[in-house]
């Protein structure tokens, strides 16, 4: 039977005794920045070209024994996981290895930078097909390493990295914290986060998704036919690099943004036991385990969206948090969340010619998060319509008045310290799908978009208060673009999208003692693109 | 690895070019920043990545590196340029004393400087 990790990433229609998905990534080149490798291992022989690049620090130790089998161990295993004949994910992918880690698995930021520069120069000298760069390494947060990754990503290269094995917030490490990089955490055969001694997989908002990373069978550098089991976020990242190679081989024109959205879309959802993560990180950590798409074509019709969380604002009175979408993505809605419930809402605003989502902390608040809903919407023309706080008692209204523009999200921002004591903000698009309505002391922001064939509708789900969490999901074929709350009198902590579900959180009634009447209502804006669906059908 | 004589020759040339007034004056209104790894054991003091502003050309990177060497030499410090970056980020990698950071941050075109640090297989 096939190894558990290959079985896990394979969609049911390909599950047989053998792992043989279509197209093994043959049009894609995968660069591996790691230790030296044993290139004549049967698993990877003829598949991996060892470049002449080497930039490593000296090994430490009073008596260091340099044994080739030890020096090659990490890199050989990962090369096998990506493209190995028997135990590889993308058996057709060709690889190039750069040595940036020494025999003890240690390298430097500068050596890694020079390696990334080497790849860029190689790409310019001899342009090939799609490139995937696998970085199965981590160091402390590095501005320069993140910047280099950003530049390489903007040159069309897909970078995949390990989240790190520190049982910590991945945002504290590089290149895991670089937004342009696909950052991968590790799960085991039980879909649990991987524990590595006292440590384990990293987590948090800088992780894009998880993948198999425990007890992974792969090439051993001990001999040319040996296999060994290894664990770590490197192994998880290698799986995603392999999946990416296969997706890019099937659709070579995919951009990084499109690839990332597809990786998220085809992942197994909500299978990870979140109790393993620290409580404050659970909401920020994606509950996604990577998998291959069920078919190599036909995903194009889907309107893809993902949720991007900002860094925490910090607790100061005027603190704000900003969430940004990738350059090729559209910000279709913006929401905010605060564990203390003290916040002053959120707004979409232009920054450097692009919309961003900004959340505002309130006096006495412990800080806020901004949550952006970032979508792939070709030929979109989106704008934000704002209504300032209304004088009239009926509240503030704003709608999408331009011909052909549809409402994709509503945001609300207020200056008063605790709007909840007056009457909470109300965003009520129901009945008038192109309109947001809010509290008269709040400014209301409507995200209005025009794109070929784009249609949207509003879905609500209300439960009588007190209620800690209310959800509403978009049905099959529709994608969640906007998520907001229609609170009654009980205090709302915020709203955010998890996959295709809008989640509204209210203050824990057990701590507040609140038994207020009214309802807590989650409002989802669900969209689809008939244009994308037609374009997809024409391709087939 | 270059030999010590080679390093010395480069320093002398750099000094002469500065005396000839070939180096540009630093720009006003922008302050370069210094960054280092938050995890002390992973720091590698003595090696620094000097990152220059985005549109800096390779020739300017090389000139800035030489200028740093010249100014350091005048203060009695030996420095070694380990690599000049171009293609991804403009800048250079330099082996030098941390005492020179204040000086380096004032060089023209400098955006920020980051102390080198360790990365590890995961």
């Amino acid at each position: 039977s096939i190894p558990w990790n290959l079985e896990r990433i394979t969609p049911p229609r390909y599950r047989a005794d053998e792992y043989q998905p279509p197209d093994g990534g043959s049009l894609v080149e995968v660069y591996l920045l790691d230790t030296s490798i044993q290139s004549d291992h049967r698993e990877i022989e003829g598949r991996v070209m060892v470049t002449d690049f080497e930039n490593v620090p000296e090994e430490d130790g009073t008596r260091f024994h340099r044994q080739a089998s030890k020096c090659d161990s990490h890199g050989t295993h990962l090369a096998g996981v990506v493209s190995g004949r028997d135990a590889g994910v993308a058996k057709g992918a060709s690889m190039r290895s750069l040595r940036v880690l020494n025999c003890q698995g240690k390298g430097t930021v500068s050596g890694t930078l020079i390696g990334l520069e080497f790849i860029r120069k190689s790409q310019l000298v001899q342009p090939v097909g799609p490139l995937v760069v696998l970085l199965p390494l981590a160091g402390g947060y590095s501005r320069v390493l993140n910047a280099a990754c950003q530049r390489l990503a903007r040159a069309g290269v897909v970078l995949v990295t390990a989240a790190g094995n520190f049982r910590d917030d991945a945002c504290l490490y590089s290149p895991a914290s670089a937004p342009e990089v696909i950052t991968v955490g590790a799960t085991n055969a039980q879909d649990q986060p991987v524990t590595l001694g006292t440590l384990g997989t990293n987590f948090g908002r800088c992780v894009d998704l998880f993948a198999p990373g425990e007890d992974i069978i792969g090439a051993s550098s001990y001999c040319s036919t040996c296999f060994v089991s290894q664990s770590g976020t490197s192994q998880a990242a290698a799986h995603v690099a392999g999946i990416a190679a296969m997706m890019l081989s099937a659709e070579p024109e995919l951009t990084l943004a499109e690839l990332r959205q597809r990786l998220i879309h085809f992942s197994a959802k909500d299978v990870i036991n979140e109790a393993w993560f620290p409580e404050d990180q659970r909401v920020l950590t994606p509950n996604l385990v990577a998998a291959l798409p069920p078919s190599t074509h036909g995903a194009g019709w889907q309107l893809f969206c993902r949720t991007v969380w900002s860094a925490h604002s910090g607790p100061t009175r005027m603190a704000t948090a900003v969430a940004r979408c990738a350059p090729d993505e559209e910000l279709l809605s913006c929401s905010s969340f605060s564990r203390s419930g003290k916040r002053r809402g959120e707004r979409m605003e232009a920054q450097g010619g692009k919309l961003v989502c900004r959340a505002h902390n309130a006096f006495g608040g412990e800080g806020v998060y901004a949550i952006a809903r970032c979508c792939l919407l070709p030929q979109a023309n989106c704008s934000v319509h704002t209504a300032p706080p209304a004088e009239a008692s009926m509240g503030t209204r704003v709608h999408c008045h331009q011909q052909g523009h549809v409402l994709t999200g509503c945001s609300s921002h207020w200056e008063v310290e605790d709007l909840g004591t007056h009457k909470p903000p109300v965003l009520r698009p129901r009945g008038q799908p192109n309109q947001c309505v809010g509290h008269r002391e709040a400014s209301i922001h409507a995200s209005c978009c025009h794109a070929p064939g784009l249609e949207c509708k509003v879905k609500e789900h209300g439960i009588p208060a007190p209620q800690e969490q209310v959800t509403v999901a978009c049905e099959e074929g529709w994608t969640l673009t906007g998520c907001s709350a229609l609170p009654g009198t009980s205090h709302v902590l915020g709203a955010y999208a998890v996959d295709n579900t809008c989640v509204v959180r209210s203050r824990d009634v057990s701590t507040t003692g609140s038994t207020s009447e009214g309802a807590v209502t989650a409002v989802a804006i669900c969209c689809r693109s008939r244009h994308l669906a037609q374009a997809s059908q024409e391709l087939q | 690895q270059e030999d010590e004589d080679g390093d010395y020759e480069e320093l002398v040339l750099a000094l002469r070019s500065e005396e000839d007034g070939l180096a540009e004056a630093p720009e006003h209104g922008t302050t370069a920043t210094f960054h280092r790894c938050a995890k002390d054991p992973w720091r590698l003091p003595g090696t620094y990545v000097v990152v220059l502003k985005e549109e800096t050309h390779l020739s300017q990177s090389e000139r800035t590196a030489r200028r740093l060497q010249a100014q350091a030499a005048r203060r009695g410090y030996l420095t070694k340029i380990l690599h000049v970056f171009h293609g991804l980020l403009p800048g250079f990698l330099v082996k030098m004393s941390g005492d020179l950071l204040e000086l380096a941050l004032k060089l023209p075109h400098v955006d920020y400087i980051e102390e080198d640090s360790s990365v590890f297989a995961q």
Epitope: D60, G61, T62, R63, F64, S73, G105, G197, L199 | D40
Partner: antibody, heavy 122, light 111 residues
């Protein structure tokens, strides 16, 4: 559960040798560095040495250099401490302990053996 | 191997907080991760804190660590009788290429 089980107590004469073992269970032994630490009666902890997960790098305390050798057999999940030319001041409880960093990042010891008492007396 | 310096003993009543200091140099505490170990009478040491201030799972949040310059500290808040033990700090020392422990501190819970 994760544990390190050490060999039994030893009584030795000065100048003789002894080999203490430490068997690991319920974790992937070959992924972790291993330490030896000793504690003389009524005294504090004294670090003796560390061996990398794959045996490729080793460190010793000054008091252990030349007389003590750390080795491991990853196929048997076992760590060893070979002590030669024993002296009376080597009398102590010897603990094996797992380094928490899978490869390199942390030296802290997160799992300890129960200890082996070595008495050196004429 | 020169040890890190700790006070020989500290004491406090149940519910109180006690802080143990650990002083070293720039080659150990100043530039290396610090860990803290608890050794109950007659047992092997147990890791309580690593990387200055992180707790392994199962260690109560009453135990916290901090570092300033070349000195690290362990604070035990809400002191309990079960906390009576010897506590050792530990750090890698880059100049010695070896691990160094503190001299040890006996924590006594009064009453």
């Amino acid at each position: 559960q994760v544990q390190l089980v050490q060999s039994g107590a030893e009584v030795k004469k000065p100048g003789s040798s002894v080999k203490v073992s430490c068997k690991a269970s319920a974790f992937t032994f070959d992924s972790f560095g291993m330490h030896w630490v000793r504690q003389a009666p009524g005294q504090g902890l004294e670090w003796m040495g560390l061996l990398w997960s794959d045996g490729s790098g080793e460190y010793y305390a000054d008091s252990a250099k030349g007389r003590f050798t750390i080795s491991r057999d990853n196929s048997k999940n076992t760590l060893y401490l070979q002590m030669n030319s024993l002296r009376s001041d080597d009398t102590a409880v010897y603990y094996c302990a797992r380094a928490m960093g899978a490869i390199y990042y942390y030296y802290a010891m997160d799992v300890w053996g129960q200890g082996t008492t070595v008495t050196v007396s004429s | 191997q020169s040890a890190l310096t700790q006070p020989p003993s500290v004491s406090g009543s149940p519910g109180q907080s006690v802080t143990i200091s650990c002083t070293g140099t720039s080659s150990n505490i100043g530039n290396q991760f610090v860990s803290w170990y608890q050794q109950l009478p007659g047992t092997a040491p147990k890791l309580m804190i690593y990387e200055y201030n992180k707790r392994p799972s199962g260690v109560p949040d009453r135990f916290s660590g901090s570092k300033s310059g070349n000195t690290a500290s362990l604070t035990i808040s809400g002191l309990q009788t079960g906390d009576e033990a010897d506590y050792y700090c530990g750090s890698w020392d880059s100049s010695l290429s070896g691990y160094v422990f503190g001299t040890g501190t006996r924590v006594t819970v009064l009453g």
